[in-house]
């Protein structure tokens, strides 16, 4: 028998520095977690103690903090090189700055193979990107060879900006021939490493003949055997065992997100490459694990540029940006409109001639808007200003909801109106009218939504049985502010870009902004 240790991360999302327990900015260092310096300490400890170790990343290193905004992926290559990752799969967020924003900072600089078997380049891009990412890589590990086959969510064109010259194929269809090829070349230990979410990971384990282990990402799935060490609630045991169609027991793993945990899986193979046993657990990277001093020093060196960036002007406003709780928790506020407009603008994807865009709607809890921005400071807007408006380090995500769920959400928005509570929704691509004289749960009297399958966008009444795409904060997607119906009834959820980054990009693009209060949210006569 031969034993392999797989160390894995996924959805790190630019958390190079240690973070608080909820993966936001570290405040009290003695209680902070994760970060590449701490990760390196643990990885090195395991590498020294065990003979056959692979360090893998399942995608979405890009996007999530000011580190990515400023360094644009160069920080990912640099620190992943320093940690000596053995392989990485491409995630959807790796395409957030377009293909060039992937090629130059990461693909050309990474000193580890970057993988995806289901992304095929065409046209002029094919020769430009040739060899920069691979469908698979065969690695020598101790006395054996291990094949690693990559995959990426085929939804990426709707979630990011891969352009028109990359085709995202069905994962299973693309993986099978690559695995078959490796088998014919006597590679009998194969790991599928990818970024399509836990449901697809399980399907790959079930359907792709010859895959021995699946290491996944995208869905931020936390798996654990025994008593979990922090706040995350396990979605199942670690590893999650799937019985394949050909009768094999295939371990599937994922390690939550944000570099909070290091996945740790031990696999025992027989001489024919069959998995005999698998066990392990994610390791919580808490403050009991010291940060490596040399990596920490490097982080501090790279940090300097971030501090300078946060005070630079992104653009100007010529109007007061009303982000006060007195406005945003009671009525339409122009800060809410600005943020929603930025959210939609960030999700412009012309992937189908029948649609002017794949999504037109935005909802945003008023309680998530934490500060106004005064235009009387020469109109200047900085990252620092935006960090005061959106201090929680969240993301603006894409969900699919039925009309009936949206109606419930808008009823919840005003079910206890007048108490300055955070659930009052700011909107984009939606016209809502409330009648507060009616009883809670029956106050939405008009709800019109902007069409997507149209050449001239116009507002049509919401249809209860239709499925709609909506951009919203991850806080709402996770049921925050009492929006349990969103969490319980959403049909799909894909994590998006860092909230501040979305707004800062929009402001930089527009240069000068002047958002108005324009009648997106109305109250019927006599009730307000």
């Amino acid at each position: 028998a031969w034993e392999l240790t797989i160390l894995h991360t996924n959805d790190v999302h630019s958390r190079l520095e240690q973070t608080s327990e909820d993966s936001s900015k570290c405040v009290n260092a003695s209680r902070c977690m994760g970060g590449v310096a701490r990760l390196f300490t643990k990885v090195q400890q395991i590498r020294r103690a065990e003979p056959n170790v692979l360090l893998l990343d399942a995608g979405d290193q890009y996007q999530g903090t000011i580190w990515f905004t400023v360094y644009k992926g160069a920080e990912v290559a640099h620190f992943m090189n320093a940690l000596r990752y053995d392989a990485m799969a491409l995630g959807n967020h790796e395409f957030d700055n377009g293909v060039e924003g992937l090629i130059e900072p990461l693909l050309k600089e990474a000193k580890f193979p970057i993988l995806s078997a289901n992304i095929k380049a065409k046209g002029p891009l094919a020769s430009q990107i040739s060899g920069l990412y691979l469908p698979y890589k065969v690695l020598p590990v101790g006395d054996e060879v291990v094949g690693i086959v990559g995959y990426t969510s085929k939804e990426t064109p709707f979630l990011s900006n891969p352009g028109t010259n990359l085709v995202f194929e069905d994962e299973i269809t693309a993986l099978q021939p690559e695995v078959d090829k490796l088998k014919t070349l006597n590679v009998n230990k194969i790991i599928a490493l990818g970024h399509s979410g836990f449901e697809m990971d399980k399907l790959i384990a079930q359907k792709v003949r010859g895959v021995d282990v699946v290491v996944g990402g995208h869905s931020n799935t936390f798996l654990y055997t025994g008593n979990p060490p922090s706040k995350e609630v396990p979605a199942g045991k670690y590893p999650f065992i799937v019985t394949s169609d050909d009768g094999r027991k295939v371990p599937v793993v994922q390690a939550y997100a944000f570099g909070k945990y290091l996945g740790y899986l031990k696999i025992e193979f027989d001489e024919r490459g069959n998995v005999i046993s698998s066990h392990g657990n994610p390791i919580l990277l808490n403050s009991s694990i010291p940060e490596d001093p040399s990596i920490k020093a490097d982080i501090n060196k790279w940090r300097i540029k971030l501090d300078n960036y946060s005070t630079q002007e992104l653009g100007k406003t010529i109007v007061y940006l009303d982000g006060s709780s007195q406005s945003c928790r009671f009525r339409e506020c122009n800060m809410g409109n600005l943020i929603c407009d930025a959210m939609i603008n960030n999700n412009l994807r012309h992937t189908d001639e029948m649609f002017w865009n794949h999504v037109s709607m935005c909802i945003l809890n008023g309680g998530g808007i934490r500060s106004p921005i005064d235009e009387r400071n020469n109109g200047t807007i900085t990252w620092e200003n935006l960090a005061a408006v959106l201090p929680f380090g969240g993301t603006f995500d894409l969900v699919q909801l039925k009309g009936s769920t949206l109606k419930k959400a808008f009823e919840h928005s005003v079910h206890r109106y007048g108490q300055s509570t955070g659930e009052f929704l700011q909107v984009g691509g939606i016209h809502v009218v409330y009648d507060l004289s009616r009883k809670p749960g029956d106050r939405v009297v008009k709800l019109d939504v902007l069409c997507t399958k149209c050449r001239v966008p116009s507002y049509d009444p919401l249809k209860m049985d239709e499925v709609y795409k909506v951009i919203l904060p991850n806080f709402l997607a996770n049921g925050g502010d009492g929006f349990q119906m969103i969490k319980d009834e959403l049909l799909r959820h894909d994590s998006g870009d860092q909230d501040i980054n979305v707004v800062s990009t929009y402001i930089s693009k527009m240069k000068v902004i002047y958002p108005a209060v324009e009648g997106r949210i109305k109250f019927s006569t006599g009730s307000h």
Epitope: S130, P140, D143
Partner: antibody, heavy 118, light 107 residues
Framework: QVQLQESGAEVKKPGASVKVSCKAS????????MDWVRQAPGQGLEWMGD????????IYNQKFKGRVTMTRDTSTSTVYMELSSLRSEDTAVYYC???????????WGQGTLVTVSS | DIQVTQSPSFLSASVGDRVTITCKAS??????LSWYQQKPGKAPKLLIY???RLIDGVPSRFSGSGSGTEFTLTISSLQPEDFATYYC?????????FGGGTKVEIK
Amino acid sequence: QVQLQESGAEVKKPGASVKVSCKASGYTFTDSNMDWVRQAPGQGLEWMGDINPNNGGTIYNQKFKGRVTMTRDTSTSTVYMELSSLRSEDTAVYYCARTNWDYAMDYWGQGTLVTVSS
Amino acid sequence: DIQVTQSPSFLSASVGDRVTITCKASQDINSQLSWYQQKPGKAPKLLIYRANRLIDGVPSRFSGSGSGTEFTLTISSLQPEDFATYYCQQYDVFPRTFGGGTKVEIK
């Protein structure tokens, strides 16, 4: 700068064994695998095998399986290649070569000529 | 094992010429192809890896291209120091295998 210093030329009788050394300097020895390649007089290059200096793991070309042994000594940053049951067709220059992150051979030793003759 | 066939075996050219050497693998090698230059009595020197990535310090007149099973090394304008033997090698799977070599001679 990266340097790979190989041991001196050897003359061996058929049936004997030879052990060639390769001392590495200018980089972290355990961070890169080492390959061995040989070249018979006037001929092309032939890959013999690979050793991971970190854990001593080896992958050999089946053609040499049972005859070749690759080892390492981390205290001196040296790898060794021993070839046994020598025959005349093993007369060749033997090179050690460091592999880069992608496993291409980016730095080579100067070569050790092994002559097998009765 | 994957077979790697290099052509031509010999090539006569003049300084300033554009020279192309091809390498064919018996099956798709996933861009895992390197090119080496060897001068008489010396060890090989890595020029290009991953089919088209030029090693630091190697003159830009050298370039690699190709994917799948067919690869090319091009020297855009041959210089006196480029007369040598060139080898391609696949490192997609084990055992690693080399092409038979192309000797570039002065015409």
